[in-house]
Each structure stands twice: as C-alpha cells, then as structure tokens.
Amino acid sequence: CKAMHVAQPAVVLASSRGIASFVCEYASPGKATEVRVTVLRQADSQVTEVCAATYMMGNELTFLDDSICTGTSSGNQVNLTIQGLRAMDTGLYICKVELMYPPPYYLGIGNGTQIYVIDPEPCPDSDF
C-alpha cells in the first residue's frame, strides 16, 4: 500500500492563443482499469476545479462538452490541454489522479504547474 506519486512540469507558458499543455504522469501502485483525472487551480489560496474526466485504461479521456480541457492518455501518462486562457487565469494548476477501480482506491496529487498567460497585444490599426 504505497502512496501514489504524480509528476507534472513546474512551469508552462500558454501560447498567444491562450492554450497551455502539460503532461501529468503517475506511478500506479496497482493495475487500475478506471482512472479519474482532475485539474485544480490554486490562486490566492482559493482552489477551484477546472475540469475532470474519468477514463478506462486504453480508452480516450472524455471531458464534458463544455469543458475547457482536452486530453489523451498513454499508459500512466495523461497529456492535458487547457484552452481559452487569459492573463487573469495565470495560476497554479494541480493534477489530481485517482485510481477508482479495482480496489484499493489510490489518490495522487501533483505539486502543480504554474501556467503563465499573457494576453496578446491588440494589433495596431493599419494605414494600408
């Protein structure tokens, strides 16, 4: 019954289109068939859930239709993409992994990825 370790990059810079991607990797202590991945945002000591998806190992992650997250899974690695980000969304994005089935349940929480978002400068009016 060892604790589950979750690794994620320390810092990611969002693209000019407000898209940030990072890998969340977990060291599974068991042979899980059902996994839940949640992205939490921590800013000013407030924690909010950004998105969550439950998937069966070997299948694709499916976030809700209105989610700002998309992702793919490969083994014990989840590639997460968050879109629609603006400067005000800069913060620490924490990857939470839960091995839901079969028993025993395991929880793993990463140290967080600091995502920096810089709003693009508006294009100056052209004289041409």
């Epitope: 202590p29 939490l40 859930e49 439950t54 929880l107 793993g108």
Partner: antibody, heavy 118, light 107 residues
Framework: QVQLVESGGGVVQPGRSLRLSCAAS????????IHWVRQAPGKGLEWVAV????????YYADSVKGRFTISRDNSKNTLYLQMNSLRAEDTALYHC???????????WGQGTMVTVSS | EIVLTQSPGTLSLSPGERATLSCRAS??????LAWYQQKPGQAPRLLIY???SRATGIPDRFSGSGSGTDFILTINRLEPEDFAVYYC?????????FGQGTKVEIK
C-alpha cells in the same frame, strides 16, 4: 453555505434495518466523493464507507461489508446509507463527510445517532 | 490497512503553552495525512491536510509537519478553545483510517 445534514437515526433492535440520509447544499454535489464516518459513544472515529462522484465506485470498511450499502442521488443532492443486519457494535453517531479537493474530509455533518439494542 | 498511532493519549497543558502531538503510521503515507479537532458534542473540524497545509480559516498557531511515517501537529500558545481531542487520518488509499486520538486538556 456549504453544509451536510444527516437524518434517519434512531433506536433499532439487533438484526433489523435502518436507512440514513445526508442532505448536501452549497456545493456541486456530484463533483465530490462523500463518506460515512461513525463514532461509538466515548470512542474514536471509524471510517465506514465512501461513494464517488457518479455513484459507480463504492468502498466499505470490512466491519460493515455485506451489511451496509452506500448510495447517492445526485439529482436530489442526497447521500444514503442502508444498514441491514444491525449489531450492537454498530451503535454510534454517524457523520457524513465530504472528500475535499485534496482528499481530506473538509466538510462534516453534525451526525445522526443510531442505537442498536434489544 | 495502515495503522495510525497517536501519542500521547492525553496532554495536560496550560493556556499559552505549546502542544506537540505525534502521529506515527505503520507504513508510509507520503504526505496524505490530515489532522482534525473535535470538541464535545461537535463534528470533527479539518485543521491540516497534506501533512502541513492549513485548512481554510484555521489560525496560524496550528501547524503540521512530517512525511512518510512520522507526523507532528503543533499548537503554539494554546487558547482556551483549543482544548479538545485531535485525530490524525491518512487518505492516500483505501481503507481510510484514523488515529485513536489525543486529548488536550487544561492542566
């Protein structure tokens, strides 16, 4: 505000059944796992069961496995504990508790008392 | 299952003193350890999660430390409202277990 309120406790004879309820308010119920934790008079805390998110995944303490059933109705923001084949050692104050974003139990109900006695 | 052993069973102190409570796990729980406070007739209240992070609204006189198997809850400058029973709990995997509790009483 964020709260959990238990109900359904009472005095019951050994071997009989009881159903506890836990009404949640102030948060998105379906986004959290909810546990039952009990406390016998003058004793410590004992985890009983948990049900996760959509309700498909459930875990039980060995002491209640096969006798207790945890369930939830996300449309009603309500958690249940069906307790069958009750024993004297099930006598306790039963709390429901929310598994917070980081896993610890961040919100607790005040509890409902179950007394199993002949 | 992981067994959590708390010591001492009872701690007799005066207001203003420092309380040091210990929790030892039978195997590593990493940092998936929480501390709760319970007063008579009340539900437990989360104080510390992740071994050292204070829960919302918890005064900074409460602090947690440790990882792996050995953990400490420290209460600096005990206030009258701090006299209660304290439980540690691990939550990194099932089954979830609690320590037997430490009672902090007025000397």
């Amino acid at each position: 505000q964020v709260q959990l309120v238990e109900s359904g406790g009472g005095v019951v004879q050994p071997g009989r059944s009881l159903r506890l309820s836990c009404a949640a308010s102030g948060f998105t119920f379906s986004s959290y796992g909810i546990h039952w934790v009990r406390q016998a008079p003058g004793k410590g805390l004992e985890w009983v069961a948990v049900i996760w998110y959509g309700g498909n995944n459930k875990y039980y303490a060995d002491s209640v496995k096969g006798r207790f059933t945890i369930s939830r109705d996300n449309s009603k923001n309500t958690l249940y504990l069906q307790m069958n084949s009750l024993r004297a050692e099930d006598t306790a104050l039963y709390h429901c508790a929310r598994s917070g974003n980081f896993g610890a139990f961040d919100i607790w109900g005040q509890g409902t008392m179950v007394t199993v006695s002949s | 299952e992981i067994v959590l052993t708390q010591s001492p069973g009872t701690l007799s102190l005066s207001p203003g003193e420092r309380a040091t409570l210990s929790c030892r796990a039978s195997q590593s729980v990493s940092s998936y350890l929480a501390w709760y406070q319970q007063k008579p007739g009340q539900a437990p209240r989360l104080l510390i999660y992740g071994a050292s992070s204070r829960a919302t609204g918890i005064p900074d006189r409460f602090s947690g430390s440790g990882s792996g198997t050995d953990f400490i809850l420290t209460i600096n400058r005990l206030e009258p409202e701090d006299f209660a029973v304290y439980y540690c709990q691990h939550y990194g995997n099932s089954p979830w277990t609690f320590g037997q509790g430490t009672k902090v009483e007025i000397k």
